[in-house]
């Protein structure tokens, strides 16, 4: 089978500070040295890119400076963290993995992680 399987949790609840973390694990059919990981958000039939990082196996993920994502890698496992989430960002977040080099190229698409974000209640005014 030449398909690459990508596993990610079905559901994650973001913290009260709007931070959600999940693991994206892929079963590599080949010995990849350069991997690209993309987080996609699917709402209805629209798919948008949340963030993306390319890394050399054994090195750290490098997201752009203004990215809302951070992450670390360990073998075929990527630990992803998305920050700054609000209730309106609740949705399905898909992990996409591409083995860019060496040939052949492989694409892996996860089933998605439903991230639930609940905006914190504002603190009540206090006399103290």
């Amino acid at each position: 089978c030449k398909a690459m399987h990508v596993a990610q949790p079905a559901v994650v609840l973001a913290s009260s500070r709007g931070i959600a973390s999940f693991v994206c694990e892929y079963a590599s059919p080949g010995k990849a040295t350069e991997v690209r990981v993309t987080v996609l958000r699917q709402a209805d039939s629209q798919v948008t890119e949340v963030c993306a990082a390319t890394y050399m196996m054994g090195n750290e993920l490098t997201f752009l400076d203004d990215s809302i994502c951070t992450g670390t890698s360990s073998g075929n496992q990527v630990n992803l963290t998305i920050q700054g989430l609000r209730a309106m960002d609740t949705g399905l977040y898909i992990c996409k993995v591409e083995l860019m080099y060496p040939p052949p190229y492989y694409l892996g698409i996860g089933n998605g992680t439903q991230i639930y974000v609940i905006d914190p209640e504002p603190c009540p005014d206090s006399d103290f």
Epitope: C1, K2, A3, M4, H5, P29, E34, R36, T38, L40, V47, T48, E49, A52, I94, K96, M100, Y101, P103, P104, Y105, Y106, L107, G108, I109
Partner: antibody, heavy 118, light 108 residues
């Protein structure tokens, strides 16, 4: 409007060269992989070449390897295909296509005809 | 290389009838990586189905995809006049990207 527009096709003699261009608009070009696909007259679709987001990685069909070179200029939202040592069997309509976020070719240009004949 | 074989080569159907197109892969293709395209004469291909069964934006629900492993099917439940065209399956899970040879759906 989200679209791809190819140009550069034409008539060329065997052994000649041609450079195709594909102008992208209406989307963030650098966030997508890109492909060239061709279709010989009356035949099916044949994938020709792929280029990664930043242009660092390129893949080619065996039939064009060593003769064709794919490239992109993200600043100009443009994709290119340099075709050298052209053969009669390279005669086809050449399409540029966007590799969608989930993988399929979700956006295609209208195509440009390349005819290789003496 | 994954070879995709489509059948039949030509399908003659009357408008309003159902059309069933087959695509068989030489080795297992993950269902997430199988697409169907429609092409009309003089036009570029148009994405219909991706991930074996998800309809692309703007595609009517008379088009549906199914299958897994090596056998995939595109079904057009009730053929409209504009559906007579050539249909291609494609795998996009690994390089080289490959297409089937196409099935022509013609008016009976």
């Amino acid at each position: 409007e989200v679209q791809l527009v190819e140009s550069g096709g034409g008539l060329v003699k065997p052994g000649g060269s041609l450079r195709l261009s594909c102008a992208a608009s209406g989307f963030t070009f650098s966030s997508y992989t890109m492909h060239w696909v061709r279709q010989a007259p009356g035949k099916g679709l044949e994938w020709v070449s792929f280029i990664s987001y930043d242009g660092n990685y390129k893949y080619y069909a065996d039939s064009v390897k060593g003769r064709f070179t794919i490239s992109r200029d993200n600043a100009k939202n443009s994709l290119y295909l340099q075709m050298n040592s052209l053969r009669a069997e390279d005669t086809a309509v050449y399409y540029c296509a966007r590799g969608g976020h989930l993988g399929p070719f979700d956006l295609w240009g209208q195509g440009t005809m390349v005819t290789v004949s003496s | 290389e994954i070879v995709l074989t489509q059948s039949p080569g030509t399908l003659s159907v009357s408008p309003g009838e159902r059309a069933t197109l087959s695509c068989r892969a030489s080795q297992s293709v993950g269902s997430s990586y199988l697409a169907w395209y429609q092409q009309k004469p003089g036009q570029a291909p148009r994405l219909l189905i991706y991930g074996a069964f998800s309809r692309a934006t703007g595609i009517p629900d008379r088009f549906s995809g199914s299958g897994s492993g090596t056998d995939f099917t595109l079904t057009i439940s009730r053929l409209e006049p504009e559906d007579f065209a050539v249909y291609y399956c494609q795998q996009y899970g690994s390089s080289p990207w490959t297409f089937g040879q196409g099935t022509k759906v013609e008016i009976k």
